[in-house]
Interface confidence: low
């Protein structure tokens, strides 16, 4: 069937349109185009005779039409009047006629629109504003944008006049925005420049800052007033109803009790004609006395005595506050406050309760602090410590031992050897010792104020032979690239040299290896798997030497990035797929597989028999080391070709 297609259907003025003919019959004599929906000689545009290839213009020909041998008609430089129907009249060689009708619509290219407004300075909650999109254009659609967004749904927004007019009822300050209108027709769209709506509002109720209403005599009063307003508000201050000044800030230096009263800020907006006021009541106080602390026990004994601290002077209707170590009181069952908070009781004091303690008196305005008080808590003695820590000595050297025990007041010391009292000093000195000086050395510490005593016993061995050393470690299973390990050679002996060997060799030079504590401690920073070796320490003096048994470091590492073998990525259908995954790790990792993201078995080897092209995809091996808490994975693409075809490379191969 003969049909006409208009390309395009909607045509812009000045552009062109092609009336394209489909299913044109064979064996034609000629054809003719007419304006309208029927054949009318008065409205003929152009005729065409195939035999002569001659085109003949008709009464409706405008000089803008071109007819093609395939009967299609091109109309150029389209005008509004071209809108409508077009009829093609086809005359076949057997003089049988056939007709078809097509149509198109013509629209103007739209000009850039602009926005007109009926009110350039509307007042909040009072005025309405009507925006109109100019010019008025036939067959055009009007759209509106607020801050480059489509119109929000609001009962205060109304479109009228075919959406050409946007009315905002009862404008608010939030309507201050960028407004644009847009005109559209089927062939063009244009957007206006933005119009900013300037809404007059306020003043809102002013706020007076700062908020505090209580001041001390002698301070400066500096009040500031602010009210949201457009245009900005004008401010006035009144004190007890009397006008003071027309400024936003009110400053009164060196105030007295007489400056107490009501302070009013008035905000005025000259454009809206509105006034708003806020009142604050200011109270000025005279200075209170400085507090001080008294105590019922100046030298309490640890774990025995209680102490009551009292804040003086006693003032009626006053709030008392306490601080310990410059912090508010901690929650503790050993701390108790009296009903009026004036007395703080410490039950069963400890050495940590020394303070300092402060109390404060709070008036309506501020807090006055006392001077700090420190408690002299009597404690100790604790278990004494004997230094140095050596237990082995060579004959002929001097033995010098020192004793210390935490105590208040400081402890008095006594030394005993094998239970026999030696001297009442903090230090014990014996020159040129022999094997006979081996024995039990006891330090006794005594606190004369509390009457308590404590002792510590140390075994001293005097011998020419050094004992066999041993290695202690602070970390038996360090994690690679994370942990450090400190080996210590035991025991600690006087005038002794400490040596280290790794795998039977002396220590390599490395910034990760550090000797300390007189070479007695060997620290390995940021251990690696290569540090998993045998470590031996040795001790020697001028007459003997000895070595420890080896200690092997067990370094946890990995898992490293796994390797999937074999490396092939292309397989023939029917083959067996046998993928093995390996990752360096200590301890051995756990393995799992995923095919195309779907979890499979938790094994090191993935086996699929007689694969088909359905087995194409990504094969991922995941490894995890529970000891190091680390994971790793690798992905491999597998392509399976049907038997008999040459397997190509897969994507990602």
């Amino acid at each position: 069937k003969l049909t006409i297609e208009s390309t395009p259907f909607n045509v812009a003025e000045g552009k062109e349109v092609l009336l394209l003919v489909h299913n044109l019959p064979q064996h034609l004599f000629g054809y003719s185009w007419y304006k309208g929906e029927r054949v009318d000689g008065n409205r003929q545009i152009i005729g065409y005779v195939i035999g002569t290839q001659q085109a003949t213009p008709g009464p409706a020909y405008s000089g803008r039409e071109i007819i093609y041998p395939n009967a299609s008609l091109l109309i150029q430089n389209i005008i509004q009047n071209d809108t409508g129907f077009y009829t093609l009249h086809v005359i076949k060689s057997d003089l049988v006629n056939e007709e078809a009708t097509g149509q198109f619509r013509v629209y103007p290219e739209l000009p850039k629109p602009s926005i007109s407004s009926n009110n350039s300075k509307p007042v909040e909650d009072k005025d309405a504003v009507a925006f109109t999109c100019e010019p008025e254009t036939q067959d055009a659609t009007y759209l509106w944008w607020v801050n480059n967004q489509s119109l929000p749904v609001s009962p205060r927004l109304q479109l009228s006049n075919g959406n050409r007019t946007l009315t905002l009822f009862n404008v608010t300050r939030n309507d201050t925005a960028s407004y644009k209108c847009e005109t559209q027709n089927p062939v063009s769209a244009r957007r206006s420049d933005s119009v900013i709506l300037n809404v007059l509002y306020g003043p809102d109720a002013p706020t007076i800052s700062p908020l505090n209403t209580s001041y001390r005599s002698g301070e400066n009063l500096n009040l500031s007033c602010h009210a949201a307003s457009n245009p900005p508000a004008q401010y006035s201050w009144f004190v007890n109803g009397t006008f003071q000044q027309s400024t936003q800030e009110l400053f009164i230096p060196n105030i007295t009790v007489n400056n107490s009263g009501s302070y009013t800020c008035q905000a005025h907006n000259s454009d809206t004609g509105l006034n708003r006021t806020t009142v604050t009541t200011i109270t000025v106080y005279a200075e209170p006395p400085k507090p001080f602390i008294t105590s019922n026990n100046s030298n309490p004994v640890e774990d025995e005595d209680a102490v009551a601290l009292t804040c003086e002077p006693e003032i009626q209707n006053t709030t008392y506050l306490w601080w310990v170590n410059n912090q508010s009181l901690p929650v503790s069952p050993r701390l108790q406050l009296s009903n009026d908070n004036r007395t703080l009781t410490l039950l069963s004091v400890t050495r940590n309760d020394v303070g300092p303690y402060e109390c404060g008196i709070q008036n309506e305005l501020s807090v006055d602090h006392s001077d700090p008080v420190i408690l002299n808590v009597l404690y100790g003695p604790d278990d004494p410590t004997i230094s140095p820590s050596y237990t082995y000595y060579r004959p002929g050297v001097n033995l010098s031992l020192s004793c210390h025990a935490a105590s208040n007041p400081p402890a008095q010391y006594s030394w005993l050897i094998d239970g026999n009292i030696q001297q009442h000093t903090q230090e014990l000195f014996i020159s040129n010792i022999t094997e006979k000086n081996s024995g039990l050395y006891t330090c006794q510490a005594n606190n004369s104020a509390s009457g308590h005593s404590r002792t510590t016993v140390k075994t001293i061995t005097v011998s020419a032979e050094l004992p066999k050393p041993s290695i202690s470690s602070n970390n038996s299973k360090p994690v690679e690239d994370k942990d450090a390990v400190a080996f210590t050679c035991e025991p600690e002996a006087q005038n002794t040299t400490y040596l280290w060997w790794v795998n039977g060799q002396s220590l390599p030079v490395s910034p990760r290896l550090q000797l300390s504590n007189g070479n007695r401690t060997l620290t390995l920073f940021n251990v690696t798997r290569n540090d998993a070796r045998a470590y031996v320490c040795g001790i020697q003096n001028s007459v003997s030497a000895n070595r420890s048994d080896p200690v092997t470091l067990d370094v946890l590492y990995g898992p490293d990035t796994p390797i999937i073998s074999p490396p092939d990525s292309s397989y023939l259908s029917g083959a067996n797929l046998n993928l093995s995954c390996h990752s360096a790790s200590n301890p051995s990792p756990q393995y799992s597989w995923r095919i195309n993201g779907i979890p499979q078995q938790h094994t090191q080897v993935l086996f699929i028999a007689k694969i088909t092209p359905n087995n194409n995809g990504t094969y991922a091996c995941f490894v995890s080391n529970l000891a190091t808490g680390r994971n790793n994975s690798i992905v491999k693409s597998i392509t399976v070709s049907a038997s008999g075809t040459s397997p190509g490379l897969s994507a990602g191969a």
Epitope: G597, T618, V635, S637, G652, A653
Partner: nanobody
């Protein structure tokens, strides 16, 4: 914070070349797949190319095959789109995006760089 910053767009004549860069921060591009998405007025959004640096997988839309090449430098954490034999229909805003390896769905993209092909 995950960020993708595109650069390299501009005006070029038909048949010319451009190289777009996508600098990633806040994540490692070898842990995911990166794609280039283009948007042109009146046309459907199109994923023109994507790459999964971890295993070297690449994919191209039919409209750019043989003309565009996607690559990645994991040491610089940057993806590239080399565009040769540019045509007028390649005019668009090009966005760098994080792309799902499985279904090529993209859920995060940068601010875009404009490519205009015109004589």
């Amino acid at each position: 914070e995950v960020q993708l910053v595109e650069s390299g767009g501009g005006l070029v004549q038909p048949g010319g070349s451009l190289r777009l860069s996508c600098a990633a921060s806040g994540f490692n591009i070898k842990d995911t797949c990166i794609g280039w998405v283009r948007r042109a007025p009146g046309k459907e959004e199109e994923l023109v190319a994507n790459i999964c640096p971890y295993h070297g997988y690449t994919r191209y839309a039919d409209s750019v095959k043989g003309r565009f090449t996607i690559s990645a430098d994991t040491s610089k954490n940057t993806a590239y789109l080399q565009m040769n034999s540019l045509r007028a229909e390649d005019t668009a805003v090009y966005y760098c995006a994080i792309v799902s390896y499985v279904d090529e769905y993209y859920n995060y993209w940068g601010q875009g760089t404009t490519v205009t092909v015109s004589s």
